[in-house]
Amino acid sequence: YSHWPSCCPSKGQDTSEELLRWSTVPVPPLEPARPNRHPESCRASEDGPLNSRAISPWRYELDRDLNRLPQDLYHARCLCPHCVSLQTGSHMDPRGNSELLYHNQTVFYRRPCHGEKGTHKGYCLERRLYRVSLACVCVRPRVMG
Amino acid sequence: YSHWPSCCPSKGQDTSEELLRWSTVPVPPLEPARPNRHPESCRASEDGPLNSRAISPWRYELDRDLNRLPQDLYHARCLCPHCVSLQTGSHMDPRGNSELLYHNQTVFYRRPCHGEKGTHKGYCLERRLYRVSLACVCVRPRVMG
């Protein structure tokens, strides 16, 4: 049920129809605050960005692909298997798990376009879903019924 | 079911360069698990999706705009001001705050295109950053220096 017509030129389609400029709007990482000074430490800070103050702290890992829009994606990586105690900010509490929250993000890949006779005609953007981890969340473990 | 007609070249832009194909990949919302049965309750469940098992539980609120791609975005809304106790799953612990994690997501808006003489020439896709709240995170409150 295509609501928006196709962009890659199909047979008999005018290539000037559907255009997306590969613009240079920066895409900042998920958490725009200051990065964790001790990215690998399993502790909850009392200052700094959300990901370092969380009791399920995480760091961001860059995933760059120059043939993708956005070119830069960031994946959260949990720094602790369990949640950190709210009291101390350092001891782990085995009653809570630090779990990744995932999201299937829409991205666009640059692919060669082919004209009517199979000739290369510039580039198409191909829409895809790309799984990214957004954050680590402190959760109660599942109780199996 | 074509809702968005054509995109158009801007002045001096090679029309065959960047074309966008609308394939039919579904774009699921953030958290693919079972929704919270009591969406407004400030408690951490022992089953269900991540957003209901979190000690900083949240619900999702739909933000729909038919002139945007993706048309549907989901904003997290925290169900508790503080974190829920890992032990009970219901009592709040004032030592922890439930804070929203924000992200500037890349979206595309449908805008009228204008030809060289200012004439309307179909529609262009305009890339923008759009602020969404992804999740609620249990954090230690900031200690002001």
Partner: antibody, heavy 121, light 107 residues
């Protein structure tokens, strides 16, 4: 074949609450949002809200916030609407309706339940 | 909220007639308009989506047109089973809103 089977008619007392169910079959329940619509006096149709079974994400008509609560049970492919603190104004036929989606875009309520009549008296 | 108005609340026509039902929006809705048919037993079916696209299984005698704020549904050759109430609905912006309905009867 897509089918939405709603629960039967209800007679309820003023001040009470009640829950209407809508069991979906013939399609993947989590792939489509579910809308709820009120029809008073056999005429006007009013959109109540929608829920996405995939993540429980909701959107409500302001006129029904605090009156209707939408939930789903993914395991039984059933959508629910709870109506709270009922008054005579809530007497109506309530419909669930699947929202058509082509993998990108929403377009219409393409399949409707048979309706559930609620009488508050 | 966007208001949808169906000025004609009831309409009488003869079998075989061409019937047009109109609907107007309080602001431009960019063709995001659907038409539904409700039979006397309460059954509701989608006829037309996005102003003019025919839903699967709907007879080709039904068609839709319009733009901006003004839209219409046309039945080219009225059949007995078309006796029903017809509603327009905008989906340009939430909350979705419906017209008041036009009841179609046989002369």
């Amino acid at each position: 074949e897509v089918q939405l089977q709603q629960s039967g008619p209800e007679l309820v007392k003023p001040g009470a609450s009640m829950k209407i169910s809508c069991k979906a079959s013939g399609y993947s329940f989590t792939d489509y949002t579910m809308n709820w619509v009120k029809q008073s006096h056999g005429k006007n149709l009013e959109w109540i809200g929608l829920i996405n079974p995939y993540n429980g994400g909701t959107s409500y008509n302001q006129n029904f916030k605090g009156k209707a609560t939408l939930t789903v049970d993914k395991s039984s492919s059933t959508a629910y609407m709870e109506l709270l603190s009922l008054t005579s104004e809530d007497s109506a036929v309530y419909y669930c309706a699947r929202e058509g989606y082509d993998g990108y875009l929403y377009f219409a309520m393409d399949y409707w339940g048979q309706g559930t009549s609620v009488t508050v008296s | 909220d966007i208001q949808m108005t169906q000025t004609t609340s009831s309409l009488s026509a003869s079998l075989g007639d061409r019937v047009t039902i109109s609907c107007s929006a309080s602001q431009g809705i960019s063709n995001y308009l659907n038409w539904y048919q409700q039979k006397a037993d309460g059954t509701v079916e989608l006829l037309i989506y996005y102003t003019s696209s025919l839903h699967s299984g709907v007879p080709s005698r039904f068609s839709g047109s319009g733009s901006g704020t003004d839209y219409s549904l046309t039945i080219s050759n009225l059949e007995p089973e078309d006796i029903a109430t017809y509603y327009c609905q905008q989906y340009s912006k939430l909350p979705y809103t419906f017209g008041g309905g036009t009841k179609l009867e046989i002369k």
